[in-house]
Amino acid sequence: CDLPQTHSLRNRRALILLAQMGRISPFSCLKDRHEFRFPEEEFDGHQFQKTQAISVLHEMIQQTFNLFSTEDSSAAWEQSLLEKFSTELYQQLNDLEACVIQEVGVEETPLMNEDFILAVRKYFQRITLYLMEKKYSPCAWEVVRAEIMRSFSFSTNLKKGLRRKD
């Protein structure tokens, strides 16, 4: 499955929107900084097959979409930017979904790497618990926004996998 060119375009647009969503100076939130431990070591040390990369990317975007679809998120961000950001994520999910569906019929690839799916889920669990602990404060959301931007950039190794022929 070849992901449409629009996918990397959507990814860039999502990042730009996420950058625009910043409402507070990150410097005023230094006391709220937190280490979420994005599983980049696990990802970087692994040569992803295309199907694995697609599944893991889908999980990352799905979790990001869910995170920004909550009532608490709606209260934290400028509505029109949040809607545009969510739409970009939703379109990315559709692109990836179509690819995964194509592969599902095929013999299970090196098991879609459940451990990578779990690593992504645990990462978002840490983010969720942090937001709850900070009572969804504006600074907490700012820290999370910056973290999600970083995680989008970290996932370049996954994106290399997308260009690989299985």
Partner: antibody, heavy 119, light 108 residues
Framework: QVQLQQPGAELVKPGASVKLSCKAS????????MHWVKQRPGQGLEWIGE????????IYNENFKSKATLTVDKSSITAFMQLSSLTSEDSAVYFC????????????WGQGTLVTVSA | QIVLTQSPAIMSASPGEKVTLTCSAG???????LYWYQQKPGSSPKLWIY???NLASGVPARFSGSGSGTSYSLTISSMEAEDAASYFC?????????FGSGTKLEIK
């Protein structure tokens, strides 16, 4: 509000198969993995596996790989679990439970379907 | 797989008594992924405590959870009749996800 509807009971003959359903409502079906859990009478809970309704990918507990097959039908917002080659060991209540994070992990369960395997 | 052992299997407590249920993991579980569920006969399990120590919505404040590594516990500071139920610990720190065999808590 989030609801997962499961039929109350299924009576099946040994060696046969059964397909259990779990109809979701109150949330976007494709946004959350759906899990299946087994509970034998008076016993603990066993995780069978999970499926992402968005694209149909599955992750199984090795112990159930040859027993259970998880599928979804997005048009009817329903998750299914097929159990094959049934024996008395498979007589149990089977629950579906929605994934999520933090306080949403397994926060929503179906009522469970009691499967009785009997000649 | 991570085996979760719960003890005792069955216990009874008088109203007002302090109760502690334990869950021991065969290998280390990160506390963020250790959950507790309450189940009453004929019903599906209910999320009771998430990430070791956080009470789920609607759970009375007399309940608390603690622990780390391989040792976790659920405590009721003062037993009430409505607390009589089975309690299961659960981990999703690694595949396959597992549940403890449960502790059945009865009221004296």
């Amino acid at each position: 509000q989030v609801q997962l509807q499961q039929p109350g009971a299924e009576l099946v003959k040994p060696g046969a198969s059964v397909k259990l359903s779990c109809k979701a409502s109150g949330y976007t079906f494709t946004n959350y993995w759906m899990h299946w859990v087994k509970q034998r009478p008076g016993q603990g809970l066993e995780w069978i596996g999970e499926i992402n309704p968005s694209h149909g990918r599955t992750i199984y507990n090795e112990n159930f790989k040859s027993k259970a097959t998880l599928t979804v039908d997005k048009s009817s917002i329903t998750a299914f679990m097929q159990l094959s080659s049934l024996t008395s060991e498979d007589s149990a209540v089977y629950f579906c439970a929605r994934g999520g994070l933090g306080p949403a992990w397994f926060a929503y369960w179906g009522q469970g379907t009691l499967v009785t395997v009997s000649a | 797989q991570i085996v979760l052992t719960q003890s005792p299997a069955i216990m009874s407590a008088s109203p007002g008594e302090k109760v502690t249920l334990t869950c021991s993991a065969g290998s280390s579980v990160d506390s963020s992924y250790l959950y507790w569920y309450q189940q009453k006969p004929g019903s599906s399990p209910k999320l009771w405590i998430y990430s070791t120590s956080n009470l789920a919505s609607g759970v009375p404040a007399r309940f608390s959870g603690s622990g780390s590594g391989t040792s976790y516990s659920l405590t009721i500071s003062s037993m009430e009749a409505e607390d009589a139920a089975s309690y299961f610990c659960h981990q999703w720190s690694s595949y396959p996800f597992t549940f403890g065999s449960g502790t059945k808590l009865e009221i004296k």
